[in-house]
């Protein structure tokens, strides 16, 4: 058992051009806090994967207000260390994620809001009990400087915190075969009581009662060398004299997986498949629960009363993400229908509807023609969210109130001339053409493609369009 400790030294703009804008302003004061997430091994897992070694949240830093015109300085930091306790052995290699969060204290939407400012990640080798390691990480234009170490909690000592120390029984020296516990020279290394008979040269134990073999040795007490000579089967009947693998306990015998995890053998060791809510090499690390307060920005934690049941966050409008950590641009979802204009007011969404539509999302099509009159004998036609008038001959405009110029659309074909008439329009056709719109050619012999012209009208006479 032990504690991983993280000391944040500074968080501010990194070197080079493109200094970030200060995350706080006079109008929107804010303060920082940090979250660290640790995972065993050199894993490159997603940020959302469980923090199997543990996680910690810092206190809030001092409130900071940007000085107008001043560049973003190093921001004021929370006091104290971030401490992540670990219960079992320190793995030696680990992955970390350090997140810098901003808590906005402005009153614009009724209270504080959290947002992720920067996230850095890395993979490191670190022996427990060693000195502080210093690090600099960059995230975009931000730079984070920090130190970290892993230290064992007494009575554990060693680079993995697996050896135990006990106060000396004699004032001057430790018992036979036992070394002083550096740096606690007044204590002695306590022998772990391994399984009785476990080879002191080829076996070891991390927990009382077990016997784990060094590479090249096997058997329940690690007394049998692993031979490369042929055997009946990898774990077939054998004896110590043949040097073959004896039918001793496999890595999953006695199920090393805690909390109901199931064990499966791997080429080198074993692997635990943990039940929901547990993580770690032996399923010994319990998951986040609602008691850990995982829901930001006013989110409500539902379920997750115990580590066996996963929690979910119900996020207030305007926030999303598994921890309500992301602000939603709710207008990007195009919630306003029928061409309505979307306005995200922070605490609420508004749709400004086009004429002819109503409702919170402009979903209701109004009766466009209700109370709308079309003048001069026009009739109202619904559609498209706005009423339209189909006007009687000679009238136009939105409400049929304007006298139409029937010749505006150049209705007379083949060079015919258009004359406005009280009842419509008249086309005076060019020679060789006839018809209401001068659309028909006259045959050279004088016969037309149409029936004979009405009495009193010669081809070429103005044809009145009725």
């Amino acid at each position: 058992a032990g504690v991983f400790e993280l000391q944040i030294h500074s968080f501010g703009p990194g070197p080079g051009p493109g200094a970030p804008r200060s995350p706080c302003s006079a109008r929107l004061p804010c303060r920082l806090f940090f979250r660290v997430c640790l995972k065993p091994g050199l894993s490159e897992e997603a940020a959302e994967s469980p923090c199997a070694l543990g996680a910690a949240l810092s206190a809030r830093g001092p409130v900071y207000t940007e000085q107008p015109g001043a560049p973003a300085p190093d921001l004021p930091l929370p006091d104290g260390l971030l401490q992540v306790p670990f219960r079992d052995a320190w793995p030696g290699t680990f992955s970390f994620i350090i997140e810098t969060w901003r808590e906005e204290l402005g009153d614009q939407i009724g209270g504080p809001a959290w947002s992720l400012l920067a996230r850095v990640a890395g993979r490191r080798r670190l022996a427990a009990g060693g000195p502080w390691a210093r690090d600099i990480q960059r995230a975009g234009a931000w730079e984070l400087r920090f130190s970290y170490r892993a230290r064992c909690e007494p009575p554990a000592v060693g680079t993995a915190c697996t050896r135990l120390c006990r106060p000396r029984s004699a004032p001057s020296r430790c018992g036979p075969g036992l070394r002083p516990c550096a740096p606690l020279e007044d204590e002695c290394e306590a022998p772990l009581v391994c399984r009785a008979g476990c080879s002191p040269e080829h076996g070891f134990c991390e927990q009382p009662g077990e016997c784990r073999c060094l590479e090249g040795w096997t058997g329940p007490l690690c007394t049998v060398p692993v031979s490369t000579s042929s055997c009946l089967s990898p774990r077939g009947p054998s004896s110590a004299t043949t040097g073959c693998l004896v039918p001793g306990p496999g890595p999953c015998d006695g199920n090393p997986c805690a909390n109901g995890g199931s064990c499966s053998e791997t080429p080198r060791s074993f692997e635990c498949t943990c039940p929901r809510g547990f993580y770690g090499l032996r399923c010994e690390v319990s998951g986040v629960t609602c008691a850990d307060g995982p829901c930001f920005n006013g989110g409500l934690c539902v379920g997750g009363a115990d580590p066996d049941s996963a929690y979910i966050c119900h996020c207030p409008p305007g926030f999303q993400g598994s921890n309500c950590e992301k602000r939603v641009d709710r207008c990007s979802l195009q919630p306003c229908r029928n061409g309505g204009l979307c306005l995200d007011l922070g605490h609420a969404l508004r749709c400004r509807c086009r004429a002819g539509f109503a409702g919170p999302r402009c979903e209701h099509d109004l009766d466009d023609c209700a109370g709308r009159a079309c003048a001069n004998g026009g009739t109202c036609v619904e559609g498209g969210g706005a009423h339209r008038c189909s006007c009687a001959l000679g009238f136009g405009g939105r409400d049929c109130r304007e006298r139409a110029d029937p010749c505006a659309a150049r209705p007379c074909a083949h060079g015919g001339r258009c004359y406005a008439h009280f009842s419509g329009l008249v086309c005076a056709c060019a020679p060789g053409y006839m018809g209401a719109r001068c659309e028909f050619p006259v045959h050279p012999d004088g016969a037309s493609a149409l029936p004979a012209a009405p009495p009193g009208l010669r081809p070429g006479d103005p044809q009145r369009y009725l």
Epitope: C295, C301, R350
Partner: antibody, heavy 118, light 108 residues
Amino acid sequence: QVQLQESGPGLVKPSETLSLTCTVSDNSISNYYWSWIRQPPGKGLEWIAYIYYSGTTNYNPSLKSRVTISLDTSKNQFSLQLSSVTAADAAVYYCARVFHWGFAFDIWGQGTMVTVSS
Amino acid sequence: EIVLTQSPGTLSLSPGERATLSCRASQRVSNTYLAWYQQNPGQAPRLLIYGASSRATGIPDRFSGSGSGTDFTLTISRLEPEDFAVYYCQQYGTSPLTFGGGTKVEIK
């Protein structure tokens, strides 16, 4: 300022289903979570359930098996149904709007008294 | 569920005096997600404080909230006649949402 108005029968027989409706005075029903809370005579407040227009609901475990909450955006209304009522369900029932920053309640209806009696 | 215990049950004070109401949670209230309400007889509750210490819109500055973890306090610096009412705390960090049993502030 938005206003909430509860409606429904003031008297329900034991073992029957209590149905209440809350009407929201403006078009903000899609912008907030909406909730029901009750208060037995002379006692404290008890949260019943809430709903969001996306379909998200959450119920008090002590009532979950008997409660249904629903929402109708076209009518700007949300409703509560409580089945198998007993005398212990007699209370003033309030509808309320969930605050935009966290699940507190910033706007309340005036409440409607429900009596359970045969 | 998180059980909220309010004390005292009744507080007898005179106008102009300072009132201190306590709300204690059976387990940590995450992120100080705690609200205070005022309820007058025959009326619906009114939101006073959210986030343990932020005043809701239109609430006079004589009302203030403080606390974190499991212990929260509502303070009324100088009691006005309209402040004599019942006060409830509510946590909204973990479902189910729960209320305290209330503190009645009455005229001495």
